[in-house]
């Protein structure tokens, strides 16, 4: 058993049929010694008396808010949550496996630049009695500070018969060094509590690996005289790290016909312009990627050929 | 060539070679063998490798003030990785394919390090850590980890030379 926060405790249980459970001793936070009784949740049934209460925690029915009283007055509370371990593996019932980029990916994170600011998100089908708490650091043995905000519900989607809820959180490294080569990964830890079930999820990454630039901005076409060719130009996104002579991007320019089946013409360039042939009803799209490190491409910025 | 102690490196040549190194480091990575282990190998093998850190002067301001600190750090790293790529980790079982980009990568690391350091001047280099793989699967794991680490290192080096070529070239 360990303390999650004041008066909230997590009991770690090996979860299998006929498991013996864990013996837990609760102590009433009071100077009083006599006449103390214990109850669980809203029940008035007295579970025991005395300053300490010993219970065998085996299942969710044994978890909940234990309260010690004296003469009708509440003295203190202890909320017991359960953390299940099945066949040596901690349960992951609360969050959905996003399966990208690999199985058992519950948290996904992205950064728009090298400033040390990043966003993480996760999915669940649970709509009520759900709380999240997020902590982060650079490295784990001698952790350096990363400040995270509160997790918020950022999207709701309908997937078949189920509703899916996306939560996200923004974090900022306290003393970021954008130009340095990261040697210690960022660690993100999410505590999830649903009713009386506790779970924790972690992700470990380098900012360089979660970089996804915003799409190029001000995408423009300039027809070339007496030609089907056009000059496409664009600019670095505002959110990208500066100076651009140091934090350089590379670009992919694509000409795509109306039909998805039509052949795509692609050009790769380090410049912020390119000359392409504009076909009727086609569109021109440009996306960006860090020039020197193959992290994610940005989403496409697009303009119609006409 | 970079002359430690004042004159500038051949920024444009360094830029071109460092960008080539980036491409080679990424093309070599998937080709050192099928690898599930990399998903689980969570402990850092790269604690002993020379990283380009915050105080090394490789940021735009530091390069403007005095690029020598940064260039020395980059040189140190290039020599270090060049030695690793020539070690038993990459030459031992399992054998790399004859046309593996690791050979080219090895040569390019040496080429860039020679551009940075003229004959007769020696910056101190770092000892290769003893990673002591005894099994082929351990070598394979280390190859992935070393190449991942090298990708990060050469990305910073390439940024330095690109910025130098754009803003510091005579």
């Amino acid at each position: 058993i360990w303390e999650l926060k004041k008066d909230v405790y997590v009991v770690e249980l090996d979860w299998y049929p006929d498991a013996p459970g864990e013996m837990v001793v609760l102590t009433c936070d009071t100077p009083e010694e006599d006449g103390i009784t214990w109850t669980l949740d809203q029940s008035s049934e007295v579970l025991g008396s005395g300053k300490t209460l010993t219970i065998q925690v085996k299942e969710f029915g044994d978890a909940g808010q234990y309260t010690c009283h004296k003469g009708g007055e509440v003295l203190s509370h202890s909320l017991l949550l359960l953390h299940k371990k099945e066949d040596g593996i901690w349960s992951t019932d609360i969050l959905k496996d996003q399966k990208e980029p690999k199985n058992k990916t519950f948290l996904r994170c992205e950064a728009k630049n090298y400033s040390g600011r990043f966003t993480c998100w996760w999915l669940t089908t649970i709509s009520t009695d759900l709380t999240f708490s997020v902590k982060s650091s650079r490295g784990s043995s001698d952790p350096q500070g990363v400040t995270c905000g509160a997790a918020t519900l950022s999207a709701e989607r309908v997937r078949g018969d189920n509703k899916e809820y996306e939560y996200s959180v923004e974090c900022q490294e306290d003393s970021a060094c954008p130009a340095a080569e990261e040697s210690l990964p960022i660690e993100v830890m999410v505590d999830a509590v649903h009713k009386l079930k506790y779970e924790n999820y972690t992700s470990s990454f380098f900012i360089r690996d979660i970089i996804k630039p915003d799409p190029p901005k001000n995408l423009q076409l300039k027809p070339l005289k007496n030609s089907r060719q056009v000059e496409v130009s664009w600019e670095y996104p505002d959110t990208w790290s500066t100076p651009h002579s140091y934090f350089s991007l590379t670009f992919c320019v694509q000409v795509q016909g109306k039909s998805k089946r039509e052949k795509k013409d692609r050009v790769f360039t380090d410049k912020t312009s390119a000359t392409v042939i504009c076909r009727k009803n086609a569109s021109i799209s440009v996306r960006a990627q860090d020039r020197y490190y193959s992290s994610s491409w940005s989403e496409w910025a697009s303009v119609p050929c006409s | 060539r970079a002359v430690p102690g004042g004159s500038s490196p051949a920024w444009t040549q360094c830029q071109q070679l460092s960008q080539k190194l980036c491409t080679l480091a990424w093309s070599a990575h998937p080709l050192v063998g099928h690898m599930d282990l990399r998903e689980e190998g969570d402990e850092e093998t790269t604690n002993d490798v020379p990283h380009i850190q915050c105080g090394d002067g490789c940021d735009p301001q530091g390069l403007r003030d005095n690029s020598q600190f940064c260039l020395q750090r980059i040189h140190q790293g290039l020599i270090f990785y060049e030695k690793l790529l020539g070690s038993d980790i990459f030459t031992g079982e399992p054998s790399l394919l004859p046309d593996s980009p690791v050979g080219q990568l090895h040569a390019s690391l040496l080429g860039l390090s020679q551009l940075l350091q003229p004959e007769g001047h020696h910056w101190e280099t770092q000892q290769i850590p003893s990673l002591s793989p005894s099994q082929p699967w351990q070598r394979l794991l280390l190859r992935f980890k070393i190449l991942r680490s090298l990708q990060a290192f050469v990305a910073v080096a390439a940024r330095v030379f690109a910025h130098g070529a754009a803003t510091l070239s005579p």
């Epitope: 040596g88 | 190998g41 082929p136 699967w137 794991l141």
Partner: antibody, heavy 121, light 111 residues
């Protein structure tokens, strides 16, 4: 379908040399390492040695001086030679494939049925 | 050599109940976060069969009631609900250092 089949003498006299051949199919010896493991009657398993994809070998130090493992990739055959046999070498000898280096980290994923070798005069 | 000590030597468990086998190594069998510990099942007259590789990965075709856990020196094989066909001897094996070594085996029977 992956198979490994051991063949060789069933009976060997003390001081003689044992030669066992392992013939594999369903995979190439240039892609997978082969180990030899033995099991004395009613006892546990003992690893003898391995031949890697590139032809290099590692042996159990306890019997290294008596052991040679070689292979012929084109014939898909691995040969175990063990000199100066003794009655304590009586065991079932297994030819075993080591799983893909990058996934299995030295786990042996396919075993032959084994061949029982008795050392007796 | 790395010595692997299995416990218990033998185990009698009722059908449908949980069976747990431990394997302790005389030194760590981890290499940069990868545990080179593997588990095998051997039935009478048959060669050993790989169940779990790298401490916790289930070999394809093996029922999900088998699971493995642990790292460094302490490892566990669990059969969550014992079936009649699970009666066998179970071995752990390390491949972190030469020579590869096996545990002494644990015989699992029906109670």
């Amino acid at each position: 379908q992956v198979t490994l089949k051991e063949s060789g003498p069933v009976l060997v006299k003390p001081t003689e040399t044992l030669t066992l051949t392992c013939t594999v199919s369903g995979f190439s010896l240039t892609s997978y390492a082969i180990s030899w493991v033995r099991q004395p009657p009613g006892k546990g398993l003992e690893w003898l040695g391995v031949i890697w994809t590139g032809g290099g070998t590692n042996y159990n130090s306890g019997i290294k001086s008596r052991l040679t493992i070689s292979k012929d990739n084109s014939k898909s055959q691995v040969v175990l030679t063990m000199t100066n046999m003794d009655p304590v070498d009586t065991a079932r000898y297994y030819c075993v494939r080591e799983g893909d280096y990058g996934s299995y980290a030295g786990a042996m994923d396919y075993w032959g049925q084994g061949t029982t070798v008795t050392v007796s005069s | 050599d790395i010595v692997l000590t299995q416990s218990p030597d033998s185990l009698a468990v009722s059908l449908g109940q949980r069976a747990t086998i431990n394997c302790r190594a005389s030194e760590s069998v981890d290499y940069y976060g990868i545990s080179s510990m593997h588990w095998f099942q051997q039935k009478p007259g048959q060669p050993p069969k790989l169940l779990i590789y790298r401490a916790s990965n289930l070999e394809s075709g093996i029922p999900a009631r088998f699971s493995g856990s642990g790292s460094r020196t302490d490892f566990t094989l669990t059969i969550s609900s014992l079936q009649a066909e699970d009666v066998a001897v179970y071995y752990c094996q390390q491949a972190n250092k030469d020579p590869y070594t096996f545990g002494g085996g644990t015989k699992v029977e029906i109670k």
